[in-house]
Interface confidence: low
């Protein structure tokens, strides 16, 4: 057959779907690889062809669109499973072609099983809620396009294994789950089960997400440098090791980049001709406030190094701060020598 632009296996799209549930999968060509959409391609006389390779097989085979009750079907650029089966797992390819043009991409589809408490190998999206920050909502994800707006589905929300009914601060509101006020005890997995009718059959969509309660923006502060501080003096003799920790607390801020860095005499350590190493460690609180520690280390400090200015800097979306470390050269202990005074006495 003639040449085809092969985009290979699109592993960025690790599609996971639950067994025995509907799944609609859009051909990635139009979303990520081509500059035109399906409608344009279709009206230009291009045809979209689907085929697949079963798990642990090398043989590409056509998808059977003649299964009972149209279990697998194609609609425009969407491949439909109504519903999926475990052995639908494999690599799926969509190919767009006519006599002069061809482009194709493959993507992995994994059909996963869940238990009665919705536990499964599915990778869960994480939804962050601000602690004690008024009313916040999570929305049942990825259910668009499964049923027309004329169909009114029933939605049931669960936390872990339990249906949400009389949760003090969480209210189911259709596709939304409202948290009247979020507490750390609200951390966990929330599942919405959307049930809708189609052609005399009833389908279920199960969507689970992880809620993580994080620090509130109303409590957020600029970075706080705990060390260095005014109470600690780094007094060293030449030849000793100089270790200065820079410990910074960052309030949780959504999408904020937290940074810590040292300057020596106003320059980055890399730009100074001394043997400096910097080691960083990061820890998080339960609400994802962050503590970063950067330890500046000079193995054998010189008297010149002890005269330099060492400043710890920190920056977040809330602001920038800096603090200088107090570094001194140890003053040698005085030597008490007996000095004989000349002419001590009358002349």
């Amino acid at each position: 057959s003639e040449r085809c632009d092969d985009w290979g296996l699109d592993t960025m799209r690790q599609i996971q779907v639950f067994e025995d549930e509907p799944a609609r999968i859009k051909c990635p060509l139009f979303e990520h690889f081509l500059k035109f959409n399906y409608s344009t391609a279709h009206s230009a006389g291009l045809t979209l062809i689907w085929y697949w390779t079963r798990q642990d097989r090398d043989l590409e085979e056509p998808i059977n669109f003649r299964l009972p009750e149209n279990r697998i079907s194609k609609e425009k650029d969407v491949l439909w499973f109504r519903p999926t089966l475990l052995n639908d797992t494999g690599n799926y390819t969509c190919m767009l072609r006519n006599t002069t043009y061809c482009s194709k991409v493959a993507f992995p589809l994994e059909v996963v099983q869940k238990d009665s408490c919705f536990n499964s190998p599915m990778k869960l999206p994480v939804h962050k809620l601000y602690i004690e920050y008024g009313i916040q909502r999570i929305t049942c994800p990825n259910v668009d396009g499964y049923f027309p707006s004329s169909v009114k589905p029933t939605i049931t929300w669960y936390m872990g294994c339990y249906k949400i009914q009389n949760f003090n601060n969480v209210i189911p509101e259709g596709m939304n789950l409202s948290f009247l006020i979020a507490f750390i005890s609200n951390n966990g997995n929330y599942t919405c089960v959307v049930t809708y009718p189609e052609n005399g059959r009833t389908f279920h969509l199960t969507r689970t997400l992880t809620v993580k309660v994080v620090g509130s923006p109303k409590n957020a502060v600029p970075p706080v440098i705990h060390s260095p501080n005014d109470h600690v003096v780094y007094e060293k003799e030449p030849g000793e090791e100089l270790l200065i920790p820079c410990t910074v607390y960052f309030s949780f801020l959504m999408d904020s980049r937290n940074e810590v860095w040292w300057t020596i005499d106003g320059k980055k350590p890399d730009d100074i001709p001394i043997d400096v190493t910097i080691n960083e460690s990061i820890s998080h609180s339960r609400t994802e406030d962050e503590t970063r520690t950067q330890i500046l280390s000079i193995k054998k400090v010189t008297s010149e190094d002890l005269k330099r200015s060492y400043v710890c800097h920190a920056r977040s979306a809330k602001g920038e701060v800096a603090k200088a470390a107090t570094v001194k050269q140890k003053v040698p202990a005085p030597r008490y020598t007996v000095e004989l005074a000349c002419g001590f006495g009358a002349t």
Epitope: T139, S149, N166, G174, N176, L180
Partner: antibody, heavy 119, light 112 residues
Framework: EVQLVESGGGLVKPGGSLRLACAAT????????MSWVRQGSGKGLEWVGR??????????DYAAPVKGRFTISRDDSKNTLYLQMNSLKTEDTAMYYC??????????WGQGTLVTVSS | DIVMTQSPLSLPVTPGEPASISCRSG???????????LAWYLQKPGQSPQLLIY???NRASGVPDRFSGSGSGTDFTLKISRVEAEDVGVYYC?????????FGQGTRLEIK
């Protein structure tokens, strides 16, 4: 920070039309139920209507005095709520506020836009 | 429609003294999930209303703790433990159990 900014108010003759807009920032607009509330000069608060989020079906409910004359809509791509007011009456003269939420109360309010219906 | 009735309609108070406003609804505002669909607002002169209390008794973010809400079903009360000059304005109760959403007539709090 949540902000709701209404616009489009003004003076209009009875029987005329006006379209109010409410630009929302600081929250995921598409997820939130939005309402219009009005207040006549020296009078109390009166609920005008509400539009649910599209995820909840986008259902729209209206207060009896405006049903059939007013239309609430939303453009989630523009984070904007609208109130199309037709066949305006003198009793529609009021400050119009857009608000967020519903079940647990209206948690945020705009500064309001004044509509005056007078010949 | 659920009719909301507030009393008193006017409330003169000495600063530092407590104040209490009553709100009665024409039918129970108790939601099937076990909370009351009642909110309280304060509208200060020349300003938009601000949410004080939701679900009958939950103080909204940033609201001083001198404000408290109580009650269930059809009878609700907003209490201010010690009135301050900045508390002047019109207080409204509102039900959100069902549409149309309805407000009380308002209670004007003024300093004696």
């Amino acid at each position: 920070e949540v902000q709701l900014v209404e616009s489009g108010g003004g003076l209009v003759k009875p029987g005329g039309s006006l379209r109010l807009a409410c630009a929302a920032t600081g929250f995921t607009f598409s997820n939130v139920w939005m309402s219009w509330v009005r207040q006549g000069s020296g009078k109390g608060l009166e609920w005008v209507g509400r539009i649910k989020s599209k995820a909840d079906g986008g259902t729209i409910d209206y207060a009896a005095p405006v049903k059939g004359r007013f239309t609430i809509s939303r453009d989630d791509s523009k984070n904007t709520l609208y109130l199309q007011m037709n066949s305006l009456k003198t009793e529609d003269t009021a400050m119009y506020y857009c608000t967020t939420g519903e079940l647990l109360g209206f948690d945020y309010w705009g500064q309001g836009t004044l509509v005056t219906v007078s010949s | 429609d659920i009719v909301m009735t507030q009393s008193p309609l006017s409330l003169p108070v000495t600063p530092g003294e407590p104040a209490s406003i009553s709100c009665r609804s024409g039918q129970s505002l108790l939601h099937s999930n076990g909370f009351n669909c009642l909110a309280w607002y304060l509208q200060k002169p020349g300003q938009s209303p601000q949410l004080l209390i939701y679900l009958g008794s939950n103080r909204a973010s940033g609201v001083p703790d001198r404000f408290s809400g109580s009650g269930s079903g059809t009878d609700f009360t907003l209490k201010i433990s010690r009135v301050e000059a900045e508390d002047v304005g019109v207080y409204y109760c509102m039900q959100t159990l069902q549409t149309p959403i309805t407000f009380g007539q308002g209670t004007r709090l003024e300093i004696k």
